[in-house]
């Protein structure tokens, strides 16, 4: 299996009740606006074939895509949560900047690409769905990167 390095986040990043609540609130607000409940972005298909030792690297890719292609373009929506949550997630992304995999990561990129394609295909509703799954993104980062 490919070896991942520097793919760790300190536990303290997830021990801040205020920003945790704001992240969950943002997800909840967006999920109320999500009419397509049959599609799941962060779930079994995303994780398929990816071992736990590679999972943090996978979630780093998802985090970066979510920030650049979803949260930044939608930054004027879902206030006041968005203005607090985006900088927090951006800090997590920065702390994972040196997280990489030595070896073949094609299976990971394939799974991430499917997520990206789904979001793009759904257009704005795909972006809303991604925001509505920020609680799952948060929990997946916590689960994989600590």
């Amino acid at each position: 299996a490919p070896i991942s390095s520097h793919c760790r986040l300190d536990k303290s990043n997830f021990q801040q009740p205020y920003i945790t609540n704001r992240t969950f609130m943002l997800a909840k607000e967006a999920s109320l606006a999500d009419n397509n409940t049959d599609v799941r972005l962060i779930g079994e298909k995303l994780f398929h074939g990816v071992s736990m030792s590679e999972r943090c690297y996978l979630m780093k890719q998802v985090l970066n895509f979510t920030l650049e292609e979803v949260l930044f373009p939608q930054s004027d929506r879902f206030q006041p949560y968005m203005q607090e949550v985006v900088p927090f997630l951006a800090r997590l992304s920065n702390r994972l900047s040196t997280c990489h995999i030595e070896g073949d990561d094609l299976h990971i990129q394939r799974n991430v690409q499917k997520l990206k394609d789904t979001v793009k295909k759904l257009g704005e509703s795909g972006e809303i769905k991604a925001i509505g799954e920020l609680d799952l993104l948060f929990m997946s980062l916590r689960n994989a990167c600590i």
């Epitope: 609540n21 909840k28 409940t37 994780f47 999972r55 609680d135 997946s140 689960n143 600590i146």
Partner: antibody
Framework: EVQLVESGGGVVRPGGSLRLSCAAS????????MNWVRQAPGKGLEWVSG????????DYAASVKGRFTISRDNAKNSLYLQMNSLRAEDTALYYC??????????????WGRGTLVTVSS | QAVLTQPSSVSGSPGQSITISCTGA?????????VSWYQQHPGKTPKLIIY???KRPSGVSNRFSGSKSGNTASLTISGLQAEDESDYYC??????????FGGGTKVTVL
């Protein structure tokens, strides 16, 4: 076939300690978060504690925090619950439970048969 | 500790549809993206029947469906059958990373 087998239950006096074990087989143990859930006789389900794949995060119900410690040994495919300062209200059947899919331990799709803990003087 | 409230009992005739509610306080921030439902027959271990609000594990009958609205999640059993007589529990991951179960609902098939 996924199998979870709990052991270590028994009768203990208030203030005493017990260590529960859960032996897992039939799946890649270190790909999954794990949980302990309990059920007092004739009562509902109560989540006790959960741990992620590598033991990096350990979460507890308020009722057991500071008294119980969850741990895992991936080399032995085993989950543990160290229970200290036991109280009468800890009397229950203790289940070991695995997440339905890897990455979401809170969806408990596989359960053991449980081990009974009785706290009584 | 967050609390999820379920009706203590619900009943219906064979072939009918019934719905079990699971309500949390408004302060249970964001919890309802993580709702799961369990079926437990007397003397048996719990069985996951719905996860992530509305997803069904493989092997679970499509007569079981989950949904949510606001702070209330719901489990609907359509085409009620005798074997559906059981206890049903909702559960949710909440924002302090603990999992909270509802008190359980006893379903009786008349």
């Amino acid at each position: 076939e996924v199998q979870l087998v709990e052991s270590g239950g028994g009768v203990v006096r208030p203030g005493g300690s017990l260590r529960l074990s859960c032996a897992a087989s039939g799946f890649t143990f270190d790909d999954y978060g794990m949980n302990w859930v309990r059920q007092a006789p004739g009562k509902g389900l109560e989540w006790v504690s959960g741990v992620n794949w590598n033991g990096g995060t350990r979460d507890y119900a308020a009722s057991v925090k500071g008294r119980f410690t969850i741990s895992r040994d991936n080399a032995k495919n085993s989950l543990y619950l160290q229970m200290n300062s036991l109280r009468a209200e800890d009397t229950a059947l203790y289940y070991c439970a695995r997440g339905w899919y890897s990455g979401a331990a809170w969806n408990m799709g596989y359960w053991g048969r449980g081990t009974l803990v009785t706290v009584s003087s | 500790q967050a609390v999820l409230t379920q009706p203590s009992s619900v009943s219906g005739s064979p072939g009918q549809s019934i719905t079990i509610s699971c309500t949390g306080a408004s302060g249970d921030v964001g919890a309802y993206n993580f709702v799961s439902w369990y079926q437990q027959h007397p003397g048996k271990t719990p069985k996951l029947i719905i996860y992530d609000v509305n997803k069904r594990p493989s092997g679970v009958s499509n007569r079981f469906s989950g949904s949510k609205s606001g702070n209330t999640a719901s489990l609907t059993i359509s085409g009620l059958q005798a074997e559906d007589e059981s206890d049903y529990y909702c559960a949710s991951l909440v924002s302090d990373f603990s999992v909270v179960f509802g008190g359980g609902t006893k379903v009786t098939v008349l």
